[in-house]
């Protein structure tokens, strides 16, 4: 009766249990009754970094100088490419793609210490009383209005990102 | 693309003033934060100041303090630094950034030099 399921490392298809290419190789052909599954080693700039099927490896990641990127661990034929930034620059985001001079803050939170030489922008999140409605690299949290000493009430309350809203006071006739 | 063209560097004495300019292109200028950042020669980058969209809001380091003001016409697309009490150690290029500071974003810069 044919396998509905396999071990680890392997794959079904035409009702057998194929052996799944180690990390480094593609495959090249799925193995038979009387053949084993055929895997080639990727080429020189490509990778693959699991026990796969793919036909295909990946192309390693290009660190690109227009970007700020360089090379922090070149790739083998198991792993990828890994990019960091140039001196001073700072990595967008964890996949490095792309490089900033500083961080900004997003609204909601505010600027705790503003970049320097060797470190980046350290943001914190507006506590109540306190908003920013913009990104920014320099701007703390600002006050909410004080609806109070401009002899007005709150009409909207105030979040992390937005300042209160004031109206005037309802006058009894 | 974004361009930004940073000008009005040059030699001056001890004590004298400067104004750079930045001509900014590829962008809607009036929507964003607005840096100047100076390299000296031989060392790292340092944040010198900072304005807001609207200009109503700024940013100076310690070193430039009451030395240096940073203003914006938002209907010319151009940013500015006014430069007085020129000291020796203010010597370096000085670039012009838009938030949020990418790699490709960085103009030639203007160099600035305080020299007797």
């Known amino acids: 009766e044919p396998p509905t399921a396999c071990r680890e490392k392997q794959y079904l298809i035409n009702s057998q249990c194929c052996s799944l290419c180690q990390p480094g190789q593609k495959l090249v052909s799925d193995c038979t009754e009387f053949t084993e599954t055929e895997c080639l080693p990727c080429g020189e700039s490509e990778f693959l970094d699991t026990w796969n099927r793919e036909t295909h490896c990946h192309q390693h990641k290009y660190c690109d100088p227009n970007l700020g990127l360089r090379v922090q661990q070149k790739g083998t034929s198991e792993t990828d490419t890994i990019c960091t930034c140039e001196e001073g620059w700072h990595c967008t985001s964890e996949a490095c793609e792309s490089c900033v001079l500083h961080r900004s803050c997003s609204p909601g939170f505010g600027v705790k210490q503003i970049a320097t030489g060797v470190s980046d922008t350290i943001c914190e999140p507006c506590p109540v009383g306190f908003f920013s409605n913009v990104s920014s690299a320099f701007e703390k949290c600002h006050p909410w209005t004080s609806c109070e000493t401009k002899d007005l009430v709150v009409q909207q309350a105030g979040t992390n990102k937005t300042d209160v809203v004031c109206g005037p006071q309802d006058r009894l006739r | 693309e974004v361009q930004l063209l940073e000008s009005g560097g040059g030699l001056v004495q001890p004590g004298g003033s400067l104004r750079l300019s930045c001509a900014a292109s590829?962008?809607?200028?009036?929507?964003?934060e607005m840096w100047w950042v100076r390299q000296a020669p031989g060392k790292g980058l340092e944040r010198v100041s900072a304005i807001n969209p609207q200009g109503t809001r700024t940013y100076y380091a310690d070193s430039v303090k009451g030395r240096f003001t940073i203003s914006r016409d938002n209907s010319k697309n151009t940013l500015y630094l006014q430069m007085n009490s020129l000291r020796a150690e203010d010597t370096a290029v000085y670039y012009c950034l838009k938030l949020p500071f990418t790699f490709e974003d960085w103009g030639q810069g203007t160099l600035v030099t305080v020299s007797s």
């Open positions: 590829g962008f809607t200028f009036r929507d964003y």
